[in-house]
Interface confidence: medium
Amino acid sequence: FKVATPYSLYVCPEGQNVTLTCRLLGPVDKGHDVTFYKTWYRSSRGEVQTCSERRPIRNLTFQDLHLHHGGHQAANTSHDLAQRHGLESASDHHGNFSITMRNLTLLDSGLYCCLVVEIRHHHSEHRVHGAMELQVQTGKDAPSNCVVYPSSSQDSENITAA
């Protein structure tokens, strides 16, 4: 399977909400011993491997934000913890999954990574991730609403399995 990032850059005004999206592509193993986790975390640019460093999103780790199910299934984080931080992650039946961040501040700017992890019983992880940048702007140059910039076809298929 692969992860596609429809948009590589989101430019948003301070105070706005934004939904970052990724899509799980390709066949997924629906075996009884296979679990899929979809989650999100922050990272930083300038690494040898994008998304290799993991940092929390608004103090919530990838474990706090993960969706846990068996493949192309719908799920969402309803737990209070995420919502108290203005976050919600969700997933639909078509492989799309997202994180919504409410009331953006300048501190939310940075690199965000979506991640799909396949785990077989008693075995290690097959990871695939996608990366996108969020720029939160303030002042007269800020857009009135979020503007999204599509990934190039190469970027949207830029799959890093780890």
Epitope: Y37, R54, R55, T61, Q63, L115, V117, H123, S124, E125
Partner: antibody, heavy 121, light 113 residues
């Protein structure tokens, strides 16, 4: 710079309890697992178990289950390895290491300097 | 548990010569979903903690000299030091992370001849 700093060497008597520590810095402590590895004198490396400090999810090697307790305090970015009743055979160097796993058990990319535990009557 | 067996137990090589260490796993550590081998190599110098050299059987960790290389797939793996330097004197361990508990080989001691 990622660093794991372990507590100092310990000399104990059989039957005593002990808790050694491993403090992480230079990275998001709650976003990575911490593993513990034993190295007995002149021997190889043995994986004891791991903990995810974000929620204290813990996995043990069957060889060490019930023999030690792994814990963490995320507020001070510190993981612990403890014994309730030491034996002479616990004499070893104990290393903590950052585990790159997301959901449990991977390669160990940064290591502490080690804590030497000596148990002798 | 997956048993990791290294050979030889010790190895004496002249400076500038090639050193080869083998590691065999009791079952395959190749994950079919991503065609990756869940195997790492570590170097432990005397009096120091281990240091990660290679993961995914052949990916060098950042900062590791390119004279170190890893190869192999499935159950048979090799760590090669293409031109041994004095600072490479150490014990080398392979480790599988295909399944828990994680397991290490018994180690191979590399010395200067």
């Amino acid at each position: 710079e990622v660093q794991l700093v372990q507590s100092g060497a310990e000399v104990k008597k059989p039957g005593e309890s002990l808790k050694i520590s491993c403090k992480g810095s230079g990275y998001s402590f709650t976003s990575y697992w911490i593993g513990w590895v034993r190295q007995m004198p002149g021997k190889g490396l043995e994986w004891m178990g791991i903990i995810y400090p974000g929620d204290s999810d813990t996995r043990y090697s069957p060889s060490f289950q019930g023999q030690v307790t792994i814990s963490a305090d995320k507020s001070i970015s510190t993981a612990y390895l403890q014994w309730s009743s030491l034996k002479a055979s616990d004499t070893a160097m104990y290393y903590c290491a950052r585990d790159d796993a997301l959901y449990g058990g991977y390669y160990l990319d940064y290591w502490g300097q080690g804590t030497l535990v000596t148990v002798s009557s | 548990d997956i048993v990791m067996t290294q050979s030889p137990d010790s190895l004496a090589v002249s400076l500038g010569e090639r050193a080869t260490i083998n590691c065999k796993s009791s079952q395959s550590v190749l994950y079919s979903s991503n065609n990756k081998n869940y195997l790492a190599w570590y170097q432990q110098k005397p009096g120091q903690p281990p240091k990660l050299l290679i993961y995914w059987a052949s990916t060098r960790e950042s900062g590791v000299p390119d004279r170190f290389s890893g190869s192999g797939s499935g159950t048979d793996f090799t760590l090669t030091i293409s031109s041994l330097q004095a600072e490479d004197v150490a014990v080398y361990y392979c480790q599988q992370y295909y399944s828990t508990p994680l397991t290490f080989g018994q180690g191979t001691k590399v010395e200067i001849k």
